[in-house]
């Protein structure tokens, strides 16, 4: 199946809130866009 980035971000924000309240953990951010250059990319849209 496919993964919707916005769904992942929504879930992440929920877990971030839970981590702060239950375990006193602070998660600043996770970047979904910081990826290496795709040297193995193929032609096509």
């Amino acid at each position: 199946g496919t993964i919707n980035v916005h769904d992942v971000e929504t879930q992440f924000n929920q877990y971030k809130t839970e981590a702060a309240s239950r375990y006193n953990l602070t998660i600043s951010d996770v970047s979904v866009s910081d990826v290496p250059f795709p040297f193995s990319a193929q032609s096509g849209a």
Partner: antibody, heavy 122, light 106 residues
Framework: EVQLVESGGGLVKPGGSLRLSCAAS????????MSWVRQAPGKRLEWVST????????YYPDSVKGRFTISRDNAKNTLYLQMNSLRAEDTAVYYC???????????????WGQGTLVTVSS | EIVLTQSPATLSLSPGERATLTCSAT?????IHWYQQRPGQSPRLLIY???NLASGIPARFSGSGSGSDYTLTISSLEPEDFAVYYC?????????FGSGTKVEIK
């Protein structure tokens, strides 16, 4: 509207340093890789450096490796190029570009700034 | 380093004519991009990943190819199409651009 505005070019002596800046607007800066491309007078385009959206992954050609440093400040929506030990052959117009790539695709340098001229001469 | 050679270096044509530009790589690449540079202007993306039209680019532009040989075609030249065209490969580092083809008015 996507805009990339370069600044910091000028005349510098061989061996000197210069820092170029590129102010980005009109898109979520941290979600895109960014690059510098240069063009010497009457010559072809030459890739100078690429940095990923979060700044973790950085690439250079051998021609500038060890002399140039690319960086970004995502809070300020600004891309930088620190150029040290400049040579006459670094004389060119330097363009800032937005890179449209992801984990398994590369859609090219889809936006370009107007360029800033760097002249290295004694 | 992959060297990209574009031919012809200069193409002299009249408006309305068909233009065929080629880009040859010294070794096989997965795809290429094409850029247009008008005199005194910054380059702009025309075709990405060999055959995909960039945003705002008219349908008279098309791209094809595979391996080490790629083609950019302009089906019917408009006055604003007279410019320099560059191919680019990003299959391996260093990323490289072609030597350029200048399309001039005959």
């Amino acid at each position: 509207e996507v805009q990339l505005v370069e600044s910091g070019g000028g005349l510098v002596k061989p061996g000197g340093s210069l820092r170029l800046s590129c102010a980005a607007s009109g898109f979520t800066f941290s979600r895109y890789g960014m690059s510098w491309v240069r063009q010497a007078p009457g010559k072809r385009l030459e890739w100078v450096s690429t940095i990923s959206g979060g700044g973790t992954y950085i690439y250079y050609p051998d021609s500038v490796k060890g002399r140039f440093t690319i960086s970004r400040d995502n809070a300020k929506n600004t891309l930088y190029l620190q150029m040290n030990s400049l040579r006459a052959e670094d004389t060119a117009v330097y363009y800032c570009t937005r890179d449209n790539y992801g984990r398994n695709y590369d859609y090219g340098m889809d936006y370009w700034g107007q360029g800033t001229l760097v002249t290295v001469s004694s | 380093e992959i060297v990209l050679t574009q031919s012809p270096a200069t193409l002299s044509l009249s408006p309305g004519e068909r233009a065929t530009l080629t880009c040859s790589a010294t070794s096989s690449v997965s795809y290429i991009h094409w850029y247009q540079q008008r005199p005194g202007q910054s380059p702009r993306l025309l075709i990405y990943s060999t055959s995909n039209l960039a945003s705002g680019i008219p349908a008279r532009f098309s791209g094809s190819g595979s391996g080490s040989d790629y083609t950019l075609t302009i089906s019917s030249l408009e006055p604003e199409d007279f410019a320099v065209y560059y191919c680019q490969q990003r299959s391996s580092s260093p990323f490289t651009f072609g030597s350029g083809t200048k399309v001039e008015i005959k």
